[in-house]
Interface confidence: low
């Protein structure tokens, strides 16, 4: 399906608004430090050029690839060398190396100020005065902070963002209407970004075979009535979509995602009974809805798996004929029967099955060798089941904040070399698994918990890759995608770690503590907790609890004092001395 002009093809397929939005996202994800106005100028220039190609596909440069056109445009930025340093060297390369170079310079933790939410009236005025600029600013600010955000999904977030302002800026109580919607979009946006980051890591670090295996398992759980051939077709198409988006090919990605949604809605009967309500929606909402659709009911009459995958004498013959297809079918059959398992567990089972066949099909009596393969699955299944049970019990006993603290201590002891901000961020997010998953019925707990933990641990892996400090983290992150979580779970106290020297400055607090939001106060306390554990890795739970209780009491006392700063100056050193004594 070749086109004389790729840019004209995508402009016509996507329409001007989506085209401009996606180009803005692409540029903002590559040049994360560039000012908004610079990006808008670049996008307008690209759009005007695309329009000339729509009018005449054989016009000059219209036959160039999108990477060439976009890369050439990015390389016109005057301050590239000053702002981005060695990234400017990418511009000396030819495609496709230039685009690969840009991708390698995407920064998962850019040094950007946190987004501050202005007063509601200020936002509503800005929205009303120039809606288009307001929405573009949203796309830009999110994209530059989340360089792997799934671009077509970001357009959907922008739609909801716009709808929230359109509705709430007319409301009697604007703030009561708007703020909960913005909080929800922020939280969902962070979750969406993290989920997509795992997909991109899976493709980039472990290849499309790993991503396809993940997709087979997940889609088979969602669409247990669909035939294997149908699931395979969806997996192939989905892999193409995510490969494109993770590779910065956002126009192709959005176009192909729209085609996939169209295909699914035209073939609902052979996919799932749950698609109907999604398919009545407009494009952006439809694609989102299809991605989030609940699992269809399992067919009632599914036979036992043992017949084809254990008892049959043809297992090795079938495996040898087409290994990946046979393993894919095994994964499909297992996953559609087990919506109660996490995708990662299903992938571990498929891996274990593959290892058994590799060993047994070379044995004297293959059938005898693999006859008990399903028994070997039992410990693999019980491990995440027990983990979820124990952690949900702990969460219910402690509540979210103290559960996060327990995880902070646990993970700081495992990998104390990791930076304190990273340990705080990751442990806080790990702790959110409790509220997210523990309230669910038993059959939904494990898929919720373990697949969420995989997303959070991937964040640890991408941050650690930027500045590697721990061989243990590198090992868990790189050896096996499906075994990352068990690898981290199995880590013990790092005996080789030399405790961090005590620094009183780390434990010096001021009156500004008192004006912080509850969340910011928690982060301050949790930062102190990590530093304590780095200083005394062998401190007991009781010792740490005592220090943290004293800390909370000290902060509360000083925040109630008339002269807060004087109180912090006087009580702070006492708290530090008492803490050192308690941990001695």
């Amino acid at each position: 399906d070749t086109h004389k002009s790729e840019v004209a093809h995508r402009f016509k397929d996507l329409g001007e608004e989506h085209f401009k939005g996606l180009v803005l996202v692409a540029f903002s994800q590559y040049l994360q430090q560039c000012p908004f106005e610079e990006h808008v100028k670049l996008v307008n220039e690209v759009t005007e050029f695309a329009k000339t190609c729509v009018a005449d596909e054989s016009a000059e440069n219209c036959d160039k690839s999108l990477h060439t056109l976009f890369g050439d445009k990015l390389c016109t930025v005057a301050t590239l060398r000053e702002t981005y340093g060695e990234m400017a060297d990418c511009c000396a390369k030819q495609e496709p190396e230039r685009n690969e170079c840009f991708l390698q310079h995407k920064d998962d933790n850019p040094n950007l100020p946190p987004l501050v939410r202005p007063e509601v009236d200020v936002m509503c005025t800005a929205f009303h005065d120039n809606e288009a600029t307001f929405l573009k600013k949203y796309l830009y600010e999110v994209a530059r902070r989340h360089p792997y955000f799934y671009a077509p999904e970001l357009l959907f977030f922008a739609a909801r963002y716009k709808a929230a302002f359109a509705e709430c800026c007319q409301a009697a109580d604007k703030a009561a209407c708007l703020l909960p919607k913005l909080d929800e979009l922020r939280d969902e946006g962070k979750a969406s970004s993290a989920k997509q980051r795992l997909k991109c890591a899976s493709l980039q670090k472990f290849g499309d075979r790993a991503f396809k295996a993940w997709a087979v398992a997940r889609l088979s759980q969602k669409f247990p009535k669909a035939e294997f051939a149908e699931v395979s077709k969806l997996v192939t198409d989905l892999t193409k979509v995510h490969t494109e988006c993770c590779h910065g090919d956002l126009l192709e990605c959005a176009d192909d995602r729209a085609d996939l949604a169209k295909y699914m809605c035209e073939n609902q009967d052979s996919i799932s009974s749950k698609l109907k309500e999604c398919c009545d929606k407009p494009l952006l909402e439809k694609s989102h809805c299809l991605a989030e659709v609940e699992n269809d009911e399992m067919p009632a009459d599914l036979p036992s798996l043992a017949a084809d995958y254990v008892e049959s004498k043809d297992v090795c013959k079938n495996y040898a004929e087409a290994k990946d297809v046979f393993l894919g079918m095994f994964l499909y059959e297992y996953a559609r029967r087990h919506p109660d398992y996490s995708v990662m567990l299903l992938l571990r089972l498929a891996k274990a099955y593959e290892a058994t066949l590799e060993k047994c099909c070379a044995a004297a009596d293959p059938h005898e060798c693999y006859a008990k393969v399903f028994d070997e699955f039992q410990p693999l299944v019980e491990e995440p089941q027990n983990l979820v049970k124990q952690n949900c019990e702990l969460f219910e006993q402690l509540g979210e904040y103290k559960f996060q603290n327990a995880l902070l201590v646990r993970y700081t002891k495992k990998v104390p070399q990791v930076s304190t901000p990273t340990l705080v961020e990751v442990s806080r997010n790990l702790g959110k698994v409790g509220a997210k998953c523990c309230k669910l019925p038993e059959a939904k707990r494990m898929p919720c918990a373990e697949d969420y933990l995989s997303v959070v641990l991937n964040r640890l892996c991408v941050l650690h890759e930027k500045t590697p400090v721990s061989e243990k983290v590198t090992k868990c992150c790189t050896e096996s995608l499906v075994n990352r979580r068990p690898c981290f779970s199995a880590l013990e106290l790092d005996e080789a770690y030399v405790p961090k020297a005590f620094n009183a400055e780390t434990f010096t607090f001021h009156a500004d503590m008192c004006t912080l939001s509850e969340k910011e106060k928690q982060v301050k306390k949790q930062t102190a907790l990590v530093e304590l554990v780095k200083h005394k890795p062998k401190a007991t739970k009781e010792q740490l609890k005592g220090v943290m209780d004293n800390f909370a009491a000290f902060v509360e006392k000083c925040c109630k004092a008339d002269d807060k700063e004087a109180c912090f100056a006087e009580e702070g050193p006492k708290f530090v001395a008492a803490s050192q004594a308690a941990l001695a």
Epitope: G15, A158, A159, P282
Partner: nanobody, 115 residues
Framework: QVQLVESGGGLVQPGGSLRLSCAAS????????MAWYRQAPGKQREFVAR???????NYPDSVKGRFTISRDNSKNTLYLQMNSLRAEDTAVYYC?????????WGQGTLVTVSS
Amino acid sequence: QVQLVESGGGLVQPGGSLRLSCAASGSIESINRMAWYRQAPGKQREFVARISKGGSTNYPDSVKGRFTISRDNSKNTLYLQMNSLRAEDTAVYYCAAGPVWEQFWGQGTLVTVSS
């Protein structure tokens, strides 16, 4: 899908007025914003006016103060009141609608401003 049908176009003298209507049908509950665009012969399609579900509007400088967009949600109809018309306002006027960006379009209605 959303279907849009424009009406109200015609011939008008410079300085005159005209009111365009656009009737929407189909899955209209998803429509958050509606707009008018126009395209003069041999020119690019250009934005004329936009209104959100909540009623906020915006216009380019070329029509500000002369054109007014409004919508009647109960009738699922969009309007464009055009006053002080000029020869350069001659174009086919399109109604457009969508949940975020205008992805559904009408067939257009011709407005000719001439003496």
